[in-house]
Interface confidence: low
């Protein structure tokens, strides 16, 4: 299910994740009770076309919402995990309230106010950086954008847009925050596997869990088609057909020695004798090519206490 979030006492409007380009009616339900959400605007939470509106949202609204698109041949159901947070007491915006980071490297750059297109808003949008209102002439608010002239590293930080949603004669505040980073011109190179070492043998205990990290670096800056993955006997983990052995969902990204690196972890819930005979390949690939480090598992020798 997709996730959406908002702040207590602000407006939150969300769309059905299954919507696509459909023009068919959408019904919304509380998924825990199957209770349908009304379309009457007098309700604080109501449905309007394909949208679910919380006017205003409250912490108690957090939960999973289901939307059903009813078309003549097929009903499509989507699920949306909505979390309403209390306003952060300080200026430090927690990660869970952040929209995607914007990366800029040009002399002039623009930041878009997230989710604003869902709302009935009127200009101007107010912009804040690390909670301070932006008043320098270098910062120009235009429609749903913030334009920054002569971008430098000092412009990095958390940018919050604040606008008003109007509904039924009432105005509601909406705020959204995203980070802005300035990237130096990067470089791309043939992948380098930093872990595990080449032809490594790892000691494991039968019946115990084991995890092996595959880490590789690809250069600096944005990397097109860079990936790390595990293979078992030259088969990708997902197709190997052994439920005990899983590749960790979601690649862990890190920056090491000014290099951009990726890590994928192979987890074995309970090592068996059979696992000792398998070959485990850590693969790293990008547009420059592919590199493979093979590792094997060996039974851990018991410590001799004599």
């Amino acid at each position: 299910s997709k996730s959406s979030w908002g702040l207590e006492n602000e407006a939150l409007i969300v769309r059905c994740p299954q919507r696509g380009r459909s023009t068919y009616p959408v019904e919304w339900y509380y998924s825990d009770t199957n209770e349908s959400i009304p379309t009457q605007k007098r309700n604080r939470i109501f449905v309007s076309r394909d949208r679910l509106k919380f006017l205003p949202a409250r912490v108690e609204d957090s939960g999973i919402y289901a939307c059903v698109i009813r078309s003549p041949n097929l009903n499509k159901t989507g699920y949306l995990n909505v979390t309403i947070h209390k306003k952060p007491p300080s200026c430090n915006i927690p990660d869970y309230l952040m929209y995607s980071t914007v990366r800029g490297s040009d002399k002039n750059f623009k930041i878009t106010c997230p989710t604003i297109d869902l709302y009935n808003w009127t200009a101007p949008v107010q912009w804040f950086k690390n909670c301070k209102a932006l008043q320098e002439p270098r910062f120009r608010a235009h429609r749903s954008y913030l334009f920054i002239d002569n971008v430098t590293h000092d412009d990095e930080g958390d940018y919050t847009c604040q606008f008003t949603h109007a509904e039924n004669g009432t105005n509601y505040i909406v705020t959204a925050t995203r980070s802005f980073t300035v990237e130096e011109k990067g470089f791309s190179m043939f992948p380098v596997i930093t872990n595990p070492p080449y032809n490594h043998t790892m000691e494991v205990e039968i019946g115990k869990p084991a995890s092996i990290a595959c880490s590789a670096c690809f250069g600096k800056g944005s990397h097109f088609l860079a990936d790390v993955l595990w293979q078992i006997n030259k088969t990708v983990v997902g197709n190997f057909g052994e439920a005990r052995i899983q590749e960790e969902e979601g690649r862990n990204e890190s920056s090491s020695n000014d290099m951009d690196c990726l890590t994928s972890v192979l987890r074995i819930t309970g090592v068996t004798e059979k696992d000792l005979s398998l070959e485990y390949d850590c693969l790293a690939l990008n547009l420059h090519g592919m590199i493979r480090h093979t590792i094997r598992l060996r039974r851990k020798q018991p410590i001799d206490h004599r």
Epitope: E8, N9, Y30, S31, D32, T33, E35, R44, I45, R58, V59, E60, D61, S62, G63, I64, K86
Partner: antibody
Amino acid sequence: EVQLLESGGGLVQPGGSLRLSCAASGFAFSSHWMHWVRQAPGKGLEWVATISSGSHSIHYADSVKGRFTISRDNSKNTLYLQMNSLRAEDTAVYYCAREAGTSYYYYGMDVWGKGTTVTVSS
Amino acid sequence: DIQMTQSPSSLSASVGDRVTITCQASQDIRNYLNWYQQKPGKAPKLLIYKASSLESGVPSRFSGSGSGTDFTLTISSLQPEDFATYYCQQSYSTPPTFGGGTKVEIK
């Protein structure tokens, strides 16, 4: 008949534990948010905790956070309040109450139990 | 947290009197306000929800009004069974908070 019936109250020493139960009947329990509200002797009403219909959303008063746990079993139509590390100031009549609107909390508490008395004293 | 202040804390009235109790919120709660009646040794009873909507089964002599921060509960003609304590409660944000109560006594 729509009814809520609390049980589990009693006398307990400071630092002790109690588990209150609230049996619901006569309505679709699994569709309603539920609350615990307490009233100290001679005092006003104080909200304690709330749980959503499917237990997605749980909230506590600051005064009980970390010590009390609200839960529900929709298959048994029962609401619970596990109270640990009890203090003298927790002495009160504890009421369970139904949220009038289903699934989100908005319309007030329209059905109340008779209450169960918790006394914390050495 | 939103503070709810009720006034008066007690009042004496006679049967047939028009009685008004006020409740003030420490911030704008729009119309998310409920009124309860509680008699000694009994559980509270919901009278009014969303500031002015009469709960089912509640006599029409009870009415509520207000929006934002100032709210009023009115009993148009006090009856013997109305002598009780009345509480307001906001349901605008967590935690839901109650006023301190207004005790309506027989004069």
